[in-house]
């Protein structure tokens, strides 16, 4: 109630002779600050004096008097909150009640605290969980109801007297609620810890033994088993007998059932501690163990590997990889069940022994077409030689080999013929499925691997074919050697280099671009008349009469080819000039007279000049000289001169006679 002082501290404190005691304490006075504090040992109230009697361990008064005990007992509190006390050292006779007599200006209070001091250090107390199972982590707790700042202690864990490796966590509490030292140890007990003694040892700061507590571990665990086998190496041959015995070395709680397992599977009707295997077969090879159960669970023995030895079984061959591509690597593996494992192998290819191959694997770094076939092997161990199994087939795939293009036609082939070619090959795997031809053309393939060229061109020089499966193999090109009449026949002037002038030496060449066969004959013709049979047609001195249309013909055994007509043009100065007169060489005066300068020239005359009987040039330059009206004085001899790019020519004189008209005669 509100008339009480409020105190908080542990109800009882524990210590032992020579140790110390630390009393954590808080208070709240009813009014004002603390003015007087006396610590009594076993105080008793004296009704007569209305005061407390008892040994005064500590006294704090206004006048400051302090008893001799003051050095051993210390008040570590203050005037309003803290009432913590320390007794160091503490003695056996300090056991009992401590009375804290508190006085303020108007109020008084007696607070009692129990002190339990033993003669020797009291033991700590080990706390265990209700059940401990193997391999399950547990926390072991060692608790001591003591802690004092002036007296350091330590708690150490021991297992069968040997310090435990695991790290313990020690904690202390010196609070108004509790005073203790506690050590916690996390620990995963094994079945072998069952029945072992765990000790928590109290030691002083120097590690000197003070007291301890011990417990015996009760570790629940599955049965622990030992398996024994006869023969001890567990290696037998088919037909031998084997005995296995299961011994329980530990079980907590007691075991209930027994069974045997092979390769993890329970053996039926085998529920005793002895397993007898009579006349074993190779199928009985495997890992054996016994299993014994209790309430915790089943326990298994170590496995015994029973090896029933036998000669190799018929072998099989595994191929990595089939089909194989030529040039790739291939590995063959001989598989044969045997115990012990085979030590030697014999390999066969198509029934023939492969020399030098004695290992389980055969590695061929680059496979070739002739490596195709059946591979088999025989395995051998100390007990004998196995049988050759059925073998495995290696399929080696490769592009078509030795591809050739064959011309089926009788030779020679002539331009315009129909040519048939076939594409042949030596071998192929997989089979050839298609063919390709070079160059490409609008040709027909009447059947697979056959090419028909209708109306073969003169320029179909070479053809190559490819036979294709997964890959294409090309044949070397074959020459068709098509024979044809000479081609591109033309006339070519080889001299002179410039235009032909009359009198020049002239050579014409009959050219052609190609001919097959090469042997040819030449023919020259002009206006249907044969001129020569050489490749050249020569003129030592060309005349205008040689001008005209020329053709040359070239022929071989296949046929003949004519050039386009070629015009031979001869350039010459004007010739055969003559003056013709119209209407005649006798003309009446007053009429019209026309003189014409006629000539033969190549190129045509470009410029005319007229002359009179005095060789005087007249101011006329056209082909025709027109006199109108003609006069008697015009009578006389005239001549003309013609000029072209080659030269000049002149005509002979032609006489014009102009006679008087009747009128003139009449006038006279």
């Amino acid at each position: 109630d509100s008339s009480k002082w409020v105190f908080e501290h542990p109800e009882t404190l524990y210590a032992w002779e020579g140790a110390c005691v630390w009393i954590p304490c808080t208070y709240r006075a009813l009014d004002g600050d603390l003015e007087s504090f006396i610590l009594f040992h076993n105080p008793e109230y004296n009704k007569n004096t209305s005061k407390f009697d008892g040994t005064r361990l500590y006294e704090s008064t206004k006048d400051g008097k302090v008893p001799s005990e003051q050095k051993r007992v210390q008040f570590l509190g203050d005037k309003n909150k803290n009432c913590t006390l320390s007794i160091h050292p503490v003695h056996l006779n300090d056991s009992g009640q401590l009375g804290l007599r508190m006085e303020s200006k108007t109020e008084k209070w007696m607070e009692r605290i129990h002190l339990n001091v033993s003669e020797r250090p009291f033991p700590p107390h080990i706390q265990l969980p209700p059940e401990i199972q193997e391999s399950q982590e547990v926390t072991l707790t060692c608790l001591l109801n003591f802690s004092c700042y002036g007296y350091p202690i330590q708690l150490q864990w021991l297992l069968e007297g040997v310090p435990m490796r695991q790290a313990a966590v020690t904690s202390t509490s010196l609070t108004i609620k509790s005073v203790f030292t506690r050590s916690e140890l996390k620990f995963s007990p094994q079945w072998s810890h069952h029945g072992k003694i765990v000790t928590c040892q109290l030691q002083d700061a120097d590690g000197k033994f003070l007291s301890n507590d011990t417990v015996q571990l009760n570790v629940k665990h599955t049965p622990k088993l030992e398996i024994k086998v006869t023969p001890s190496d567990a290696i037998v041959r088919e037909g031998d007998s084997v005995t296995m015995t299961c011994e329980v070395s530990s079980s907590n709680p007691e075991y209930t059932t027994v069974s045997w397992l092979k390769d993890g599977t329970s053996l039926k009707k085998q529920n005793t501690f002895t397993l007898n295997l009579r006349e074993v077969t190779k199928d009985q090879s495997g890992k054996y163990c016994c299993q014994v159960s209790n309430d915790v669970g089943p326990g298994r023995s170590e496995e015994v590997f029973l090896q029933v030895q036998y000669a190799p079984e018929p072998s099989t061959v595994q191929i990595l990889h089939s089909p194989a591509v030529e040039g790739s690597q291939v590995e063959f593996l001989c598989m044969s069940l045997a115990n012990p494992l085979p030590t030697n192998y014999t390999w066969y290819h198509n029934g023939k022994e492969m020399q030098g191959r004695t290992e389980e694997k055969v590695h061929i770094p680059k496979i070739l077409p002739w490596h195709a076939g059946t591979y088999s092997c025989v395995a051998e161990n100390i007990l004998g030689t196995g049988q050759r199994g059925p073998g495995a087939e290696l399929d080696v795939q490769y592009p078509p080999k030795k591809v050739t293009t064959v011309i089926q036609n009788p030779m020679p082939i002539r331009e315009g013929d129909t040519v048939t070619l076939s594409c042949n090959y030596n071998s192929s795997n997989p089979s050839v499925t298609r063919y390709e031809w070079k160059p490409h053309g609008a040709w027909e393939e009447p059947s697979l691997g056959v090419l028909k060229i209708q109306n073969v061109g003169w320029d179909n020089t070479t053809i190559a074919c490819a036979a294709c499966n997964s890959w294409c193999s090309w044949a070397s090109p074959v020459a068709l050697n098509v024979q044809y009449a000479p081609r591109d026949v033309r006339v070519r002037k080889i001299k002179p280099l410039s235009e032909i002038h009359s009198g020049n030496s002239v050579s014409l060449q009959c050219d052609f671009s190609s001919s097959h066969p090469k042997e040819v004959q030449f023919f020259w013709e002009k206006n249907g008349r044969l001129l020569g049979k050489e490749s050249q047609l020569n003129f030592d001195s060309i005349s205008p009469e040689d001008a005209g249309s020329y053709s040359c013909w070239v022929n071989n055994s296949i046929g003949q080819t004519a050039s386009k007509a070629w015009t031979l043009e001869v350039l010459y100065a004007p010739r055969r000039l003559r003056v013709s007169m119209s209407p005649g060489d006798q003309v009446m005066e007053g009429k019209s007279a026309t003189l014409t300068c006629e000539s033969d020239a190549n190129p045509p005359v470009s410029h005319y000049t007229w002359f009179d009987w005095n060789n005087q040039s007249l101011p006329y330059h056209s082909q025709k000289l027109r006199l109108e009206p003609v006069k008697v004085q015009h009578s006389g001899a005239y001549w003309c001169q013609g000029t072209n790019s080659v030269g000049k020519g002149r005509s002979p004189l032609s006489t014009l006679t102009v006679y008087y008209s009747p009128e003139t005669i009449g006038r006279r």
Epitope: E326, G327, M354, Q355, G356, R357, T358, E359, V362, H363, I364, P365, K366, L368, P369, H371, Y398, K401
Partner: antibody
């Protein structure tokens, strides 16, 4: 009959590239399993295999020289070539080309050798 | 990688004697071993392939034997023309050639 003949520059300066040609006749490098190797021999020393080319254009090189070697072939012209970059005086040797005939299994060996071509590398 | 070790490196013998050169592989080479002879200034010549098959034209005094990792070349009744260098070779080893054996006249 089978013949092989090597040709090369004879003399090179350090750091130049060596180009060798092996011209052969009497066999085709398009035949399955066929191969040609280049092998060299410094004067007074043993044989050092350099590179091999197979019918299918697969190539093998001496690991210690691989970065400097290139082997190639021209099947139609019956020629095999070897290039060695950044030559040094240590590459002075006689260079041989040799034919490896198609094997039964994987037993490649050299049944025909060229007469060799000598290379001198000057520093 | 398989390695080839040839021994001895050199050998002195007299005409008419029998000599044996050995080649050891670091792994099983399944008889795929060849032997070559090389005379001074000449190209090597094939003597034996597939460990024991004599090459065309090789005299019968030469013989190859062995299996697995151990192989040898035996020359019976040495002739003057047999002196020179001998090499073993397994294509798939690195390097393919043995170090060589120099056979000299005693």
């Amino acid at each position: 009959q089978v013949t092989l003949k090597e040709s090369g520059p004879g003399i090179l300066q350090s750091s130049q590239t060596l180009s060798l040609t092996c011209s052969f006749s009497g066999f085709s490098l398009s035949t399955s399993g066929m191969g040609v190797s280049w092998i060299r021999q410094p004067s007074g020393k043993g044989l050092e295999w350099l590179a091999h080319i197979y019918w299918d254009d697969d190539k093998r090189y001496n690991p210690s020289l691989k970065s400097r070697l290139t082997i190639s072939k021209d099947t139609s012209r019956n020629q095999v070539f070897l290039k060695i970059t950044s030559v040094d005086t240590a590459d002075t040797a006689t260079y041989y080309c040799a034919r490896a005939p198609p094997p039964n299994w994987d037993e490649y060996y050299f049944d025909y050798w060229g007469q060799g071509t000598t290379l001198t590398v000057s520093s | 990688d398989i390695q080839m070790t040839q021994s001895p490196a050199s050998l002195s013998a007299s005409v008419g004697e029998t000599v044996t050169i050995t080649c050891r592989a670091s792994g099983n080479i399944h008889n795929s071993l060849a032997w070559y002879q090389q005379k001074q200034g000449k190209s090597p010549q094939l003597l034996v392939h597939n460990a024991k098959t004599l090459a065309d034209g090789v005299p019968s005094r030469f013989s190859g034997s062995g299996s697995g990792t151990q192989y040898s070349l035996k020359i019976n009744s040495l002739q003057p023309e047999d002196f020179g260098s001998y090499y073993c070779q397994h294509f798939w080893s690195t390097p393919p050639f043995g170090g060589g054996t120099k056979l000299e006249i005693k």
